[in-house]
C-alpha cells in the first residue's frame, strides 16, 4: 500500500505519518511516531508563534526602538507579535511600522484635510476660493475669509488662499 500523501489541516506529513501540528504559542520538539504523539513546547518569554505549526524555533517579538520614535501599542504574547506605533507627532513609514517620521505640516495656502495618526501622515488640501491658511500647521484647517458685510464693513483688500480679506469702513457720502 502507498504511504499517505495528504493529511488533515491540523496535521503534517512526516516519515509516512500524519502528525499533529503544534498549537499557536508552541514549537515542535519532536515529530510523532506510530506510538508517540508530536511533542511541543511553549515559546519562551519574548517569543511567539501565531499559527498551527511545525516550527522548531519560535519567532522573536518585534522590538519597538524608541530611538526610531517607536513605542509599544500592544504587548506580544506567546501567540501574537508585539505591535509598535509611533510617539505623539510621528507616524509609521510602512505598514510594518519599523520606523517613524515627523507628521508633515500643511504650508500656507493649504489646510489640514485629515489629521495624522500613528500610522498615517497629515493629508493637506489647497484652500479653495473663500478660504485661507496663513500658517504652516499639522492641525489647522483652511479658515473662511472674514465676511466684511456682516460687520457693516467693506472689502478693502481681497483675500487669497494665504491671506484673509482686509475689511474697512464704508466711504461716507459727502454733503
Amino acid at each position: 500500500p502507498e504511504p499517505p500523501t495528504a493529511c488533515r489541516e491540523k496535521q503534517y506529513l512526516i516519515n509516512s505519518q500524519c502528525c499533529s501540528l503544534c498549537q499557536p504559542g508552541q514549537k515542535l520538539v519532536s515529530d510523532c511516531t506510530e506510538f508517540t504523539e508530536t511533542e511541543c513546547l511553549p515559546c519562551g518569554e519574548s517569543e511567539f508563534l501565531d499559527t498551527w505549526n511545525r516550527e522548531t524555533h519560535c519567532h522573536q517579538h518585534k522590538y519597538c526602538d524608541p530611538n526610531l520614535g517607536l513605542r509599544v501599542q500592544q504587548k506580544g504574547t506567546s501567540e501574537t507579535d508585539t505591535i509598535c506605533t509611533c510617539e505623539e507627532g510621528w507616524h509609521c513609514t510602512s505598514e510594518a511600522c519599523e520606523s517613524c517620521v515627523l507628521h508633515r505640516s500643511c504650508s500656507p495656502g493649504f489646510g489640514v484635510k485629515q489629521i495624522a495618526t500613528g500610522v498615517s501622515d497629515t493629508i493637506c488640501e489647497p484652500c479653495p476660493v473663500g478660504f485661507f491658511s496663513n500658517v504652516s500647521s499639522a492641525f489647522e484647517k483652511c479658515h473662511p475669509w472674514t465676511s466684511c458685510e456682516t460687520k457693516d464693513l467693506v472689502v478693502q483688500q481681497a483675500g487669497t488662499n494665504k491671506t484673509d480679506v482686509v475689511c474697512g469702513p464704508q466711504d461716507r457720502l459727502r454733503a
Partner: antibody, heavy 130, light 107 residues
C-alpha cells in the same frame, strides 16, 4: 440547527454517472473539512473521500480513486461527489452515501487535539444496476 | 492502508451488563481513534474521539481507552437504547478506515 442534507442519489446503470450533493446549514461551512462515507446494504461503513476546508486538498479510498471526484462550493454551502470517470459506476458502488463533517476537537490545556466526524447527513441511496 | 479489526463481531447482552468492545489497528495510530454508534436506518453518531474523550451529550456510561494499536469501548451499564452497531475509525492518516462493526443485541 447544524444540519447536512444529501441529495442526488437514485438508480443508475453500470458505467453511468451521478452527482451527489450535500447542503450544509447552521454552521460556517467554509471553516470545516468534510468527508463522504458510504454503507452498502447490510454492510459496514466505508470512508470514500475527504476535502479540506478550502477545497485545496482531497483524498480518496483506493476503491474509488480515479472514478469519483469530491469538490465544494463554500459560497453556496455545498459539498459534491461526482461519481464518474474511467470504468465508472459498478454494482459494488451501490450504497447509502453520507456526507460527514470533520471536526478538530482541541482543548488548549491538552497536548494535541483529535479529529472525529461529529455531524452526519441522513444519507442518499445510490443503486447501480442494469 | 491501516486495517482495524473489531471484536467480537456480534455480542448478546442484557440491560445493566458491562460490555467491552475492542478495536485493534494493524499499525500504531497513537490516539487517533473514534467510536460511533449506529442504529438501523440512521446515520452513525460520534461517541468518543481521541480514543478516550467523550463527545458532548453522550452519556457517561460510555468510555474509551487505549493508545497505539489496542483500543476499547466500554459501556458500564447497558441501557435499552444502547442496542446498536458500534464502529471504530482511525483518523491517523489517509485513507481513513473503519472497523467492520460490532452488533450489540439484547439477550
Amino acid at each position: 440547527e447544524v444540519q447536512l442534507l444529501e441529495s442526488g442519489g437514485g438508480l443508475v446503470r453500470p458505467g453511468g454517472s451521478l452527482r451527489l450533493s450535500c447542503a450544509a446549514s447552521g454552521f460556517t461551512f467554509g471553516s470545516y473539512e468534510m468527508n463522504w462515507v458510504r454503507q452498502a446494504p447490510g454492510k459496514g461503513l466505508e470512508w470514500v473521500s475527504y476535502i479540506s476546508s478550502s477545497g485545496e486538498t482531497t483524498d480518496y479510498a483506493d476503491s474509488v480513486k480515479g472514478r469519483f471526484t469530491v469538490s465544494r462550493d463554500n459560497s453556496k454551502n455545498l459539498l459534491y461527489l461526482q461519481l464518474e470517470g474511467m470504468n465508472s459506476l459498478r454494482a459494488e458502488d451501490t450504497a447509502v452515501y453520507y456526507c460527514a463533517r470533520d471536526v478538530f476537537f482541541f482543548d488548549s490545556s491538552g497536548d494535541n487535539g483529535a479529529y472525529g466526524m461529529d455531524v452526519w447527513g441522513q444519507g442518499t441511496m445510490v443503486t447501480v444496476s442494469s | 492502508d491501516i486495517q482495524l479489526t473489531q471484536s467480537p463481531s456480534s455480542l448478546t447482552a442484557s440491560v445493566g451488563d458491562r460490555v467491552t468492545i475492542t478495536c485493534r489497528s494493524s499499525q500504531g495510530i497513537r490516539s487517533s481513534l473514534a467510536w460511533y454508534q449506529q442504529k438501523p436506518g440512521k446515520p452513525p453518531k460520534l461517541l468518543i474521539y481521541g480514543a478516550s474523550s467523550l463527545e458532548g451529550g453522550v452519556p457517561s456510561r460510555f468510555s474509551g481507552s487505549g493508545s497505539g494499536t489496542d483500543f476499547t469501548l466500554t459501556i458500564s451499564s447497558l441501557q435499552p437504547e444502547d442496542f446498536a452497531t458500534y464502529y471504530c475509525q482511525q483518523l491517523n492518516s489517509f485513507p481513513s478506515t473503519f472497523g467492520q462493526g460490532t452488533k450489540l443485541e439484547i439477550k
